[in-house]
Interface confidence: low
């Protein structure tokens, strides 16, 4: 049998497993599509994304909103001809996430 | 130019973007690679996988020691059969990690 | 606050090595984009930038001088070394130890080099 | 290399009168990034050389407004407005634009 404590360590993790905007570490390059004569140093930045599970495996967790944060970032150009510029970039950061269908039904499926 | 504090901050980021195990949300039945009449609630839990980024493109984050943490689970089989089981199911939890080349360098490359 | 301060010989011969110690506080060269590099200026004459080294021990050299020019860090004494080889009397100058920003904002004091026999 | 030429050598000034020095470069000094480093130093006498106008037209933090850059490509100007005393020294431009960085010849700066 299982006890009340037992059941309720199990709820708690699988809270903290659910579809929310959790802390990623992403690639500004792959991000921003940038030529590749161009780098950024750090190569990544931290931001929240839509991460975690949904209940149903139709479901997908996915972004419902996104603010864009502005992160201090050297642009190196390669051959390096300058001193490295610091420069503000945008990356986006997902403020609120859903679980969703993966993809939309269609209307006589 | 950039100020001092600028560059702390900076360096402050990048030393969170940086390889290393993180929390991480992972599916139990595709860890397990158990049949598909037989699921798992919750169907995710968290343990910690290597992740973040290295300093060069040839360069992936890997995981060099795993230990193995055990998670009550509810073990459900499909039709239901039974009272849903409580099980321990155990999970590799990275422990420590470390850029890696993606490929072992050829002897005469 | 950011200080820099140059150290070597006042006098070398020609041929020889000239080895330049610049000391700094106020930043390590262990955070993530600093540099630190070398500049120097003939008497009444214009500037001219050496070489430079990063966080990451990136070194960048002129190009002129390239073969002539070591640069080397040692971040736990804040500390970055510069040697230059086959020293010559046009080789006389002062020699500025800077933080590399861009533009370079912080100087040392600067240490005058003759180079005489 | 890219060369910096200032002009003029010298310049005898009286205080409250402007003065102009131009600095011209022997290409373009806009990176591919849009950025134009383009910069001016003071070196005062016995001193080292200190910032005074970044990116062309920026004043460096306490930099008396009286001093101004402008230009673009491959000309550029610094300006002051009302010359005072203490403004006597060596001008120099300075390209950190293209590897390696230069330096202008200067211009001396002295009150007549």
């Known amino acids: 049998f299982y006890d009340i404590e037992t059941l309720k360590v199990i709820d708690e993790e699988w809270q903290r497993t659910q579809c929310s905007p959790r802390e990623t570490c992403v690639e500004v390059a792959s991000e921003l599509g940038k030529s590749t004569n161009t780098f950024f140093k750090p190569p990544c930045v931290n931001v929240f994304r839509c991460g975690g599970c949904c209940n149903e495996e139709s479901l997908i967790c996915m972004n419902t909103s996104t603010s864009y944060i502005s992160k201090q970032l050297f642009e190196i150009s390669v051959p390096l001809t300058s001193v490295p510029e610091l420069v503000p970039v945008k990356v986006a950061n997902h403020t609120g996430c859903k679980c969703l269908p993966t993809a939309p039904r269609h209307p006589y499926s | 130019f950039y100020d001092i504090e600028t560059l702390k901050v900076i360096d402050e980021e990048w030393q969170r973007t940086q390889c290393s195990p993180r929390e991480t949300c992972v599916e139990v039945a595709s860890e397990l690679g158990k049949s598909t009449n037989t699921f798992f609630k919750p169907p995710c839990v968290n343990v910690f996988r290597c992740g973040g980024c290295c300093n060069e493109e040839s360069l992936i984050c890997m995981n060099t020691s795993t230990s193995y943490i055990s998670k009550q689970l509810f073990e459900i089989s499909v039709p239901l059969t039974s009272v849903p089981e409580l099980v321990p199911v155990k999970v590799a939890n990275h422990t420590g990690c470390k850029c890696l080349p993606t490929a072992p360098r050829h002897p005469y490359s | 606050q950011v200080t820099l301060k140059e150290s070597g010989p006042a006098l070398v011969k020609p041929t020889q090595t000239l080895t330049l110690t610049c000391t700094f506080s106020g930043f390590s060269l262990s955070t993530y984009g600093m540099g630190v590099g070398w500049i120097r200026q003939p008497p009444g004459k214009a500037l001219e930038w050496l070489a430079n080294i990063w966080w990451n021990d990136d070194k960048y050299y002129n190009p002129v001088l390239r073969s002539r020019l070591t640069i080397s860090k040692d971040t736990s004494k804040n500390q970055v070394v510069l040697t230059m080889t086959n020293m010559d009397p046009v080789d006389t100058a002062t020699y500025y130890c800077?933080?590399?920003?861009?533009?370079?904002?912080?100087w040392g004091q600067g240490t005058l080099v003759t180079v005489s026999s | 290399d890219i060369v910096m030429t200032q002009t003029p050598l010298s310049l005898p000034v009286t205080p409250g009168e402007p003065a102009s020095i131009s600095c011209r470069s022997s290409?373009?000094?806009?990176?591919?990034?849009?950025?134009?480093?383009l910069h001016w130093y003071l070196q005062k006498p016995g001193q080292s050389p200190q910032l005074l106008i970044y990116k062309v037209s920026n004043r460096f933090s306490g930099v008396p407004d009286r001093f101004s850059g402008s230009g673009s490509g491959t000309d550029f100007t610094l300006k002051i407005s009302r010359v005072e005393a203490e403004d006597v020294g060596v001008y120099f431009c300075s390209q950190s634009t293209h590897v390696p960085w230069t330096f202008g010849g200067g211009t001396k700066v002295e009150i007549k």
């Open positions: 290409q373009s000094l806009v990176h591919i990034n849009g950025n134009t480093y």
């Open positions: 800077v933080q590399v920003t861009n533009p370079f904002v912080f």
